[in-house]
Interface confidence: low
Amino acid sequence: DAHKSEVAHRFKDLGEENFKALVLIAFAQYLQQCPFEDHVKLVNEVTEFAKTCVADESAENCDKSLHTLFGDKLCTVATLRETYGEMADCCAKQEPERNECFLQHKDDNPNLPRLVRPEVDVMCTAFHDNEETFLKKYLYEIARRHPYFYAPELLFFAKRYKAAFTECCQAADKAACLLPKLDELRDEGKASSAKQRLKCASLQKFGERAFKAWAVARLSQRFPKAEFAEVSKLVTDLTKVHTECCHGDLLECADDRADLAKYICENQDSISSKLKECCEKPLLEKSHCIAEVENDEMPADLPSLAADFVESKDVCKNYAEAKDVFLGMFLYEYARRHPDYSVVLLLRLAKTYETTLEKCCAAADPHECYAKVFDEFKPLVEEPQNLIKQNCELFEQLGEYKFQNALLVRYTKKVPQVSTPTLVEVSRNLGKVGSKCCKHPEAKRMPCAEDYLSVVLNQLCVLHEKTPVSDRVTKCCTESLVNRRPCFSALEVDETYVPKEFNAETFTFHADICTLSEKERQIKKQTALVELVKHKPKATKEQLKAVMDDFAAFVEKCCKADDKETCFAEEGKKLVAASQAALGL
């Protein structure tokens, strides 16, 4: 399937609009600090060049790889050294090392200003004045803040973003129409980014085998009627798509994702009965819909797993002949029978099964040795079940905000060295598991909760990797992908931590807190809570609750005062003194 010109091939396959959008995303994900106008200029130059190659694939440079073409273009940026420092050294390298170098410099937490949403009329005017620039700017701003965002999915978000403005800017009440849609896109976008970040971390840190195992388990749950050969084919194709996107090969990724969606729809009768509606949609919606499709019903009368994987005398023979295929079949058979398990639990079971076979197939009596392997699964299954039960009870008792606070305290005590903004962000997201998953019946709770927690803990891992401060975080993040959550759950209070010096400035608040949204006000209070725990890691729940209640009362009082700023200054001093006394600081 070799093409004389790769750039011409992708331009023709994707069409000009998608080609330009994907190149813009790729460039913004690599050079996250570059101004919008610079990126647009680079994209236009690449597009014009691609058109010359479409016209004549033998034209000069048209035979170069996309990495070479895009890397050469990025390396023409005049301010590379001043803006990006050592990233400029990448340009001295040859492909493929140059692309690897760019990838290593992607920043999960770039120093960029928060995106502030303008007034609705201002946005609608900008949309009508120049729709194309407005939408490009959306792609650029999201891509540079989320350097691993799944590019073809970002095209889907942009399509919905455009639809929202097209509809709402002509509505009677523009704000009432538009703002909820933008909030929904923002929240879905953050979730999509975090999910994709886990896929990329899985591929980059733990390798293709780990990603394929995840995919076998998830697709087998989703498509339990599909044969193992069918699931294997889908896993191979899906792995290629995500490897490409995580590697910055966004044109190939989008093209291959479209092919995969086409294949799934053309073969839906041997994959899943739930795909019909998805397959009637246009391409971007179709791909998104397939990725989110509900699990198909399990086939009736599936035989017991024990027959093939425990009782059979051929277990070791089958295992020895093709280890990964046999383990893949085990994972497929277990997962299709257990939509009620999280993917990470299924992977732990498969790992336990593999370890048992490695040990037992070398023993004098293998069958005797592995006969009880399924008994070893029981505690592995019960651990997340019990944890979810306890935490859902706590969530129902406290509500989301206070549940987040409980987790903030818990995680700050486990890993107090982690930066306060990271602890607040991660704990708030961990706390969202309650409203996201606890409403589900028991059969859906574990896959919802534990797989969501895997995504959130990966955020902690990638943020911590940028500036490592805790050996415990490093250990939990790097030892085993599937045991990250149990590893963090098992951490107790860090007894080696030396409490932070008390700094009154950290607990000084001003009248600007009164004009913040409820969410932003919560974040301020939760930031203070983390700082309190860092000062007094041995503080009891009751002590912390008393201080936080006083703090809430203080904010409420001063926000109602005529002279707010004076109130915050004077009452703030009293609050700090009272808190120090309450906590024995």
Partner: nanobody, 123 residues
Framework: EVQLVESGGGVVQAGGSLRLSCAAS????????MGWFRQAPGKERERVVS????????YYADSVKGRFTISRDNAENTVYLQMNSLKPEDTALYYC????????????????WGQGTLVTVSS
């Protein structure tokens, strides 16, 4: 040994109908998507129509939509092509093909091919 044997070709007047059959042996028929391709004299081979393994999903080239119908009988290991309102430009050698993994429908995905049956539409 896998065999695909086409039958039902012949000469027909424009506007007339033909039904082609393709009998498969030597493979698990229900595990294969099936397709009909055609090659007119001096032209490249093109995909006309395909049907997925269970028969639930079909593809038709724009040039035959509304005139041709593909169906399969997994019990009989046979795929059929009902051709109505035939036109002179439908004149070609019609090949039956089987694909284990049918994605884009391009020729290279089809693993097994028949020898072809000739369809001639006279005006």
């Amino acid at each position: 040994e896998v065999q695909l044997v086409e039958s039902g070709g012949g000469v027909v007047q424009a506007g007339g109908s033909l039904r082609l059959s393709c009998a498969a042996s030597g493979l698990t028929f229900s595990s294969y998507a099936m397709g009909w391709f055609r090659q007119a004299p001096g032209k490249e081979r093109e995909r006309v129509v395909s049907i997925s393994r269970g028969g639930g999903y079909t593809y038709y080239a724009d040039s035959v939509k509304g005139r041709f119908t593909i169906s399969r009988d997994n019990a009989e290991n046979t795929v059929y092509l009902q051709m109505n309102s035939l036109k002179p430009e439908d004149t070609a050698l019609y090949y039956c093909a089987a694909a284990r993994y049918w994605a884009t429908g391009s020729e290279y995905e089809f693993d097994y091919w028949g020898q072809g049956t000739l369809v001639t539409v006279s005006s």
